[in-house]
Interface confidence: medium
């Protein structure tokens, strides 16, 4: 059964001090991740016992194994059903506590009734405050039965339930007509799915014979032990004030378990702790009684004394529940009540015994659940005991269940049953998840859901390059942390798999499914530098750069040029997609702007170091284009250009620039300055005869303006070859401004 206990503090003088605590002894309880088990839940269940709404209750988690409910403001907040849910998957279990008001009209003689299938259950509601009206019995919130007030017997209303079946289980209540339901007596009936002493699907299996008030679970045959007892058959008492399947928990407060109600998984239900009784678990056991609710009688023999927490304390030379067994009778010593092994392992099990005559190797045997008897392979004989060692054949799932160690001598015999749990090593159901990647490392989340049994003790990550036959590399990691695989090859696919292990020999599970994870490109390491740049207009910039010379191939796919306009807070990025490029023309820039410029090499999505930055000032934008440009041939070597000044000038024109190009020619155009800005005509001389020319012009103020329209004109024929075109007035003094 799941190790889950719901504790109710019944010191009810002040409801604000009342609390409910749910404690789990399960491994990995309450961690809250799907892979490692859902959290503990503790809540009031208003589906059956409806009470007027009050302020919300406060839930506090104390670590992963404990949750406490507080915030009760008035006694009526306490009345009703509370439940705690814990355990994972198929082991998810609900523990229920039913709280009755101490001031109710009717009080249950006993709150929890655990009965076997086919038994007669009798619920008894004691009259605490009499009303001369009918009593309504309800089952799970629905009308069930009515009793006339005259039908009370010895101040009790009885509800007899003959031949009960598992569906009869639930919350029962007895309420006077015309009385608040808070004054009801509330009961919990638990009907085991089998008759007395039986368990299993067809109720064919025999229960282990639970001691000290333990109840045999009808599904798995385990004893659900009362608080304060442990062992396969609840044969062992915990120290005073301790509870839990392994006595690992301690009652809070200085008065130990006084005033606490303990609720355990069905079919146990609720009781006081060992050594206590009464409706509020505040009364110590009467002499001769012990255990939960003081339900057990000591009946100690041979001078044994009764301890209200553990039962008979035997004098030297005697043992047994009632000190009825002489120490001459052989006795199994210190046998663990529960052992856990992994599937397909071949464990060694030890069984120690003492007695007079002294047990020898052949007198100790081990019996499996299927009845197979194993004989010990060796025995260690010590002065006070003989320890037999058994080599168990390879375990299968059917070996789960109750094993028995038996010792027989002429002095008598003893046997001890213990539970063997065969656990299935965990196998991941999914591949690990890639979180981030770099050129030489992958960050992986190993946390995956799994089949088989937990808890997970280690997680191994196996990895190797895809399609490789080399050995797998392995890294052991913490289950709850992400893993970084280091020193990998760039731009390489890796097959990655998870392997989970649980505690114990043979706890390693099979490898999970593989997944492909690919490392990133190597980072480019070369730092370019800017060779130079020049302005090719108010919005155009030509940039050139170089790279250091290094042996081997260039690691890079291209270059990224960045222009930062600090005034506007804007960045312009230009991608040059050839790693061989060393120059680029940047267009569409903002005239008159101060830019910071740098260049860096890129590879895949990774950027190398940026060049030292350069600072570039683009000239401001120039004036509009001249209007109505017209060309007229004057001779075989002269053409006259006429135009009109641009409109809406921002300032006085400093000069005009004329561009001359032979139509259809492949050479660069020639630029000629017209330095008298007031002129609206000029003659271009030194042209070739019978040649077609293209002309356009622009004005300059602080910067060059827009080009005018292009005009065509041919020189007249039969002239000699000229030396080249010049402008009329300054031909002798100025060359061509190219």
């Amino acid at each position: 059964a799941v190790d889950l206990t719901l504790l109710a503090n019944l010191r009810l003088t002040d409801p604000q001090r009342f609390f409910l605590t749910c404690v789990s002894g399960e491994a990995g309880a309450g961690r809250g991740s799907d892979a490692w088990g859902p959290p503990l839940l503790l809540e009031k269940d208003d589906r059956i016992v409806r009470t007027p709404p009050g302020p919300p209750l406060r839930l506090a988690r104390n670590g992963s194994h404990q949750v406490t409910l507080r915030g009760f403001s008035k006694p009526s907040d306490l009345v009703g059903v509370f439940s705690c849910v814990g355990g994972a998957g198929a082991r998810r279990t609900r523990v229920i506590y039913v709280h009755n008001s101490p001031g109710a009209h009717l009080l249950p003689d006993k709150v929890t009734h655990t009965v076997n299938k086919g038994d007669t259950a009798v619920l008894s509601a004691r009259v605490h405050k009499e009303k001369q009206t009918d009593v309504i019995w309800k089952s799970n919130g629905s009308y069930f039965y009515t009793l006339d007030w005259h039908e009370a017997q010895d101040g009790r209303f009885l509800l007899q339930l003959p031949n009960v079946q598992p569906p009869s289980s639930g919350i029962y209540s007895a309420t006077y007509l015309e009385a608040s339901p808070l004054g009801s007596a509330f009961f919990r009936l638990i009907v085991r799915g089998c008759g007395a002493g039986r368990w299993g699907p067809g109720c064919t299996k025999e229960c282990p014979g639970c001691l000290h008030g333990g109840v045999c679970h009808d599904h798995d045959g385990e004893c659900v032990c009362p608080p304060g007892f442990t062992g396969t058959r609840c044969e062992q008492a915990c120290r005073e004030g301790r509870f839990g399947q392994s006595c690992q928990e301690q009652c809070p407060g200085i008065s130990g378990c006084r005033g606490l109600t303990f609720c355990l998984p069905d079919p146990y239900g609720c009781s006081c702790g060992s050594g206590w009784r009464g409706s509020q678990c505040q009364e110590a056991c009467a002499p001769g009684h012990f255990g939960a609710d003081c339900r057990l009688q000591c009946q100690c023999q041979n001078g044994g004394t009764c301890d209200r927490f553990s039962g008979c304390v035997c004098p030297s030379g005697w043992h047994g529940v009632h000190c009825e067994k002489s120490d001459r009778i052989p006795q199994i010593l210190n046998m663990a009540s529960e052992l856990e092994f992994n599937l397909e392992t071949m464990p060694r099990i030890n069984c120690a015994a003492a007695g007079n005559p002294f047990p020898v190797r052949g007198s100790i045997e081990l019996r499996k659940p299927d009845g197979t008897v194993l004989l010990s392979t060796k025995a260690i004989v010590e002065p006070e005991k003989t320890t037999a060692e058994f080599e168990v054949p390879r375990l299968v799932l059917a070996d789960s269940g109750f094993w028995e160690c038996r010792v027989s001598t002429s002095g008598g015999q003893d046997s001890r049953r213990f539970k063997v749990n065969v656990k299935v090593p965990p196998v991941p159901l999914a591949a690990p998840r890639l979180l981030t990647k770099q050129s030489r490392q992958l960050v992986v989340s190993p946390l995956v859901s799994f089949s088989g049994d937990g808890p997970i003790s280690t997680v191994r990550l196996h990895y190797r390059p895809q399609d490789s036959t080399m050995d797998w590399s392995t890294i052991v990691v913490d289950p709850s942390e992400n893993v970084t695989l280091m020193n990998l090859r760039p731009k390489t696919g890796y097959s990655v798999r998870v392997q989970l292990s649980r505690p114990g020999e043979g706890g390693e599970g099979a490898w999970g499914p593989p997944t492909l994870m690919t490392t990133d490109c190597p980072e480019p390491l070369l730092q370019p530098w800017l060779e130079g740049w020049h302005v090719e207009g108010t919005d155009r910039l030509r940039v050139s750069w170089s790279l250091p010379l290094v042996p081997g191939p260039l690691v890079g796919d291209g270059f990224l040029l960045r222009l930062w306009d600090g005034t506007r807070g804007q960045e312009r990025r230009e991608n040059v997609s050839s790693p061989q490029a060393r120059t680029a023309l940047l267009t569409g820039l903002t005239p008159g702007t101060h830019y910071q410029l740098d260049v860096q090499l890129y590879h895949c999505t990774l950027l190398g170091p940026a060049s030292p930055p350069a600072h570039v000032l683009l000239p401001p934008s120039g004036p509009p284009a001249p209007r109505h440009l017209h060309a007229q041939a004057l001779s075989d070597s002269e053409i006259q250009l006429t135009w009109k000044h641009p409109e809406a000038l921002p300032g006085p024109i400093s000069k005009y620039v004329v561009e001359v190009q032979v139509a259809g020619g492949a050479g660069d155009p020639l630029w000629i300055d017209v330095d008298r800005p007031e002129e609206t005509s000029t003659i271009i001389r030194g042209l070739n005869a019978s040649t077609r020319y293209l002309f356009r012009m622009r004005a300059s103020i602080q910067g060059l303006g827009d080009w005018s329209n292009t005009v065509e004109e041919s020189t007249l024929g039969n002239g000699l070859q000229a030396e080249g075109p010049v402008q009329e007035s300054r031909a002798a003094e100025e060359g061509l401004d190219q």
């Epitope: 409806r50 039965y145 009515t146 006339d148 005259h150 039908e151 007509l177 009385a179 339901p181």
Partner: antibody
Framework: EVQLLESGGGLVQPGGSLRLSCAAS????????MVWVRQAPGKGLEWVSS????????RYADSVKGRFTISRDNSKNTLYLQMNSLRAEDTAVYYC?????????????????????WGQGTMVTVSS | DIQMTQSPATLSLSPGERATLSCRAS???????LAWYQQKPGQAPRLLIY???SRATGIPDRFSGSGSGTEFTLTISSLQSEDFGVYYC?????????FGQGTKVEIK
């Protein structure tokens, strides 16, 4: 379907006896209180007797006390009314009915209820 | 015993009209303990209203009950042809359980 079916009525002489039966179906008979109510020809309704699920506590109208006995057999889902020392004024249609309970308007307090399910009735005539 | 008195003895109305039936108790009856029944000729009574104002299962909402203490009323907001018959009030606070003498609602 919830149903009650009376039988056993008939003509009987004054001083005679008659046993009425009421067969219940469609609900858990053994859980409910039951009553007999009668209606003399052309008259109103008169409660006669009531019984609790256990068969224990019973109540009677003053007019029939000592002469009539109500009983039940939960294993047969049947209610009975044994009528002795019959008089002419006992002539009536006898109805069996289920006696319910419900919650008051707050939804928290259970309250004794009316007679929510009735049989079709059986006629008893006492005449010489 | 608590005496229950109904008025009027007979109420003659046409379909579609509103019917108001009264019931008076000889001593105070909490509203939680008053019921109304309908009975048609040759049939068993049928529970209409319990707790003075709560409609029983399957009863149309044209039937409504009100009142407390000693004065109670059953109202049928718009009479249908199937609503004609005798209506009884009943107290179930004390023993013996007592009924009114009935109000007959007939077609005008």
């Amino acid at each position: 379907e919830v149903q009650l079916l009376e039988s056993g009525g008939g003509l009987v002489q004054p001083g005679g006896s008659l046993r009425l039966s009421c067969a219940a179906s469609g609900f858990t008979f053994s859980s409910y209180r039951m009553v007999w109510v009668r209606q003399a020809p052309g008259k109103g309704l008169e409660w006669v007797s009531s019984i609790y699920p256990s068969g224990g506590p019973t109540r009677y109208a003053d007019s029939v006390k000592g002469r009539f006995t109500i009983s039940r057999d939960n294993s047969k889902n049947t209610l009975y009314l044994q009528m002795n020392s019959l008089r002419a004024e006992d002539t009536a249609v006898y109805y069996c009915a289920r006696w319910s309970y419900y919650y008051d308007s707050s939804g928290y307090y259970p309250v004794s209820g009316p007679f929510d399910i009735w049989g079709q009735g059986t006629m008893v005539t006492v005449s010489s | 015993d608590i005496q229950m008195t109904q008025s009027p003895a007979t109420l003659s109305l046409s379909p579609g009209e509103r019917a108001t039936l009264s019931c008076r108790a000889s001593q105070s009856v909490s509203s939680s303990y008053l019921a109304w029944y309908q009975q048609k000729p040759g049939q068993a009574p049928r529970l209409l209203i319990y707790g003075a104002s709560s409609r029983a299962t399957g009863i149309p909402d044209r039937f409504s009950g009100s009142g407390s203490g000693t004065e109670f009323t059953l109202t049928i907001s718009s009479l249908q042809s199937e609503d004609f018959g005798v209506y009884y009030c009943q107290q179930y606070k004390d023993w013996p359980r007592t009924f009114g003498q009935g109000t007959k609602v007939e077609i005008k």
